[in-house]
């Protein structure tokens, strides 16, 4: 006999990275017929919602009107059908951005390279932070973590056309409080690759430095969010 229900999906709209003082909605999608949803923040009960009528609703929203550093952290949700509770959702890392200062991002040897060339990003911020984050924009975005007193290096290694895209970096004051984003840097990778094994669909990065986020930068991408797990996997876990 089933003791728990399947875990719900949790995500943030419009994004898990929320500028301070801006609004964000945490969405939790379970099953039709769920009579109660609970949102937990850093392991403690944060909010409860009881959808009406439960048989016609499979998703609830928890609205945060004014994002700040106290609201940033790890969220999860559970739901109940009758007396049976679900497994907890994956953890959603909600990050507050636009804190304090703006880093500068540069790329060597330059923003336009040939496939196979080694590329390194540099994120610099002169204020008190020792951790930096490099993000590539897009639905399947990758976040790389780097360390340094005022600057962090992000070596991508030999690049392929899959590395093309727009990059930004942040200084991180703690796990969930990030600086303003840098100005974007667009990396262009040209050149036909003879050895197609060098061109994966997505860049692969060392497991110890990369966490994968499935991001949605558009609010209306998909109504059926069960198709997508928009959970931000905790980069620092």
């Amino acid at each position: 006999q089933q003791q728990t229900l399947p875990k719900p999906f949790i995500w943030a709209e419009p994004h898990f990275m929320v500028p301070k003082e801006k609004q964000v909605t945490i969405c939790c999608q379970g099953n039709y017929g769920a009579v109660e949803y609970q949102l937990h923040f850093e392991g403690s009960l944060f909010a409860v919602d009881r959808p009406k009528p439960p048989e016609r609703i499979n998703k609830v929203q928890f609205y945060i009107p004014d994002m700040n550093s106290r609201m940033a952290g790890q969220y999860s949700c559970i739901y109940r059908v009758g007396e049976l509770w679900s497994e907890p959702s994956n953890l959603l890392d909600l990050v507050v951005t636009e804190m304090y200062d703006t880093p500068t991002l540069s790329v060597h040897p330059g923003p336009e390279v040939i496939s196979g060339e080694k590329v390194t990003f540099y994120c610099r911020l002169d204020t008190a932070t020792s951790m930096f984050l490099l993000l590539k924009e897009g639905r399947s975005s990758h976040v790389q973590r780097g360390y340094g007193k005022v600057q962090a290096e992000f070596p991508l290694g030999p690049v392929t056309t899959a590395h093309r895209g727009t990059y930004r970096c942040f200084g991180s004051y703690n796990n969930h409080a990030w600086s303003f984003p840098s100005e974007p840097v667009k990396l262009l990778v040209t050149g036909d690759i003879e050895n197609t094994s060098l061109a994966p669909e997505d860049p692969t990065f060392p497991a110890d430095t990369w966490g994968t986020y499935l991001l949605t930068t558009e609010t209306g991408l998909q109504k059926d969010h069960a198709l997508w797990d928009h959970t931000a996997q905790n980069l620092l876990r």
Epitope: S106, H108, P109, G110, P111, E112, V113, I114, S115, G116, E117, K118, V119, T120, P158, T160, L188, T190, G191, D192, I193, E194, N195, L198
Partner: antibody, heavy 118, light 107 residues
Framework: EVQLQQSGPELVKPGTSVKISCKTS????????MHWVKQSHGKSLEWFGG????????SYNQKFKGKATLTVDKSSSTAYMELRSLTSEDSAVYYC???????????WGQGTTLTVSS | DIVMTQSPATLSVTPGDRVSLSCRAS??????LHWFQQKSHESPRLLIK???QSISGIPSRFSGSGSGSDFTLSINSVEPEDVGVYYC?????????FGPGTKLELK
């Protein structure tokens, strides 16, 4: 010591082709892209194109579209530029130059003088 | 294509002079600007990378500044061996482009 040794001067007839070589030593050939730069007599420098020995990926200056083909031989750590349909306009000194991934063209060959004349 | 222009075309100097060579890009290239020196019958040599960063083995009298589209190479006390042509290079976008050069000569 990093060295880029280019092939000797060439005197060729219009309409023919020529293949210039750039033999490298002193570093890992596949880690740096190799670029070719043209310098006509008394003129500035013009980037012809570049190749990544690691992947075989190339990028060409569209101004010289179809004029050159860049290749490498990894076994001998040598880069090549083949120029075709030569005219007197192609008479120049051609340099190979290594593009460092933390700067620009940090090492250059000594240049190969190409003269196209009937 | 990004067009690089340099001024002056020729600069006549006396040893010990402090000189400034100008380079302008047709659009912003941030700090992706490199300077080269080419002496007569020699290959070019990298002097300054990323607008202002020094290169190992290059005398400290050479320095660079600027960002965006306006850049300057300075030689704070010219030596006779500095005679040659100085080129700036766009390292931002393909095609990589060079300026027409500034010829430095002795008076």
């Amino acid at each position: 010591e990093v060295q880029l040794q280019q092939s000797g001067p060439e005197l060729v007839k219009p309409g023919t082709s020529v293949k210039i070589s750039c033999k490298t030593s002193g570093y890992t050939f596949t880690e740096y892209s190799m670029h070719w730069v043209k310098q006509s007599h008394g003129k500035s420098l013009e980037w012809f194109g570049g190749i990544s020995p690691n992947s075989g990926g190339t990028s060409y200056n569209q101004k010289f579209k179809g004029k050159a083909t860049l290749t490498v031989d990894k076994s001998s750590s040598t880069a090549y530029m083949e120029l075709r349909s030569l005219t007197s306009e192609d008479s120049a000194v051609y340099y190979c130059a290594r593009r460092d991934f933390h700067s620009s063209f940090d090492y250059w060959g000594q240049g190969t003088t190409l003269t196209v004349s009937s | 294509d990004i067009v690089m222009t340099q001024s002056p075309a020729t600069l006549s100097v006396t040893p010990g002079d402090r000189v400034s060579l100008s380079c302008r890009a047709s659009q912003s290239i941030s700090d992706y600007l490199h300077w080269f020196q080419q002496k007569s019958h020699e290959s070019p040599r990298l002097l300054i990378k990323y607008a202002s960063q020094s290169i190992s083995g290059i005398p400290s009298r050479f320095s660079g500044s600027g960002s965006g589209s306006d850049f300057t190479l300075s030689i704070n006390s010219v030596e006779p061996e500095d005679v040659g042509v100085y080129y700036c290079q766009n390292g931002h976008s393909f095609p990589l482009t060079f300026g027409p050069g500034t010829k430095l000569e002795l008076k």
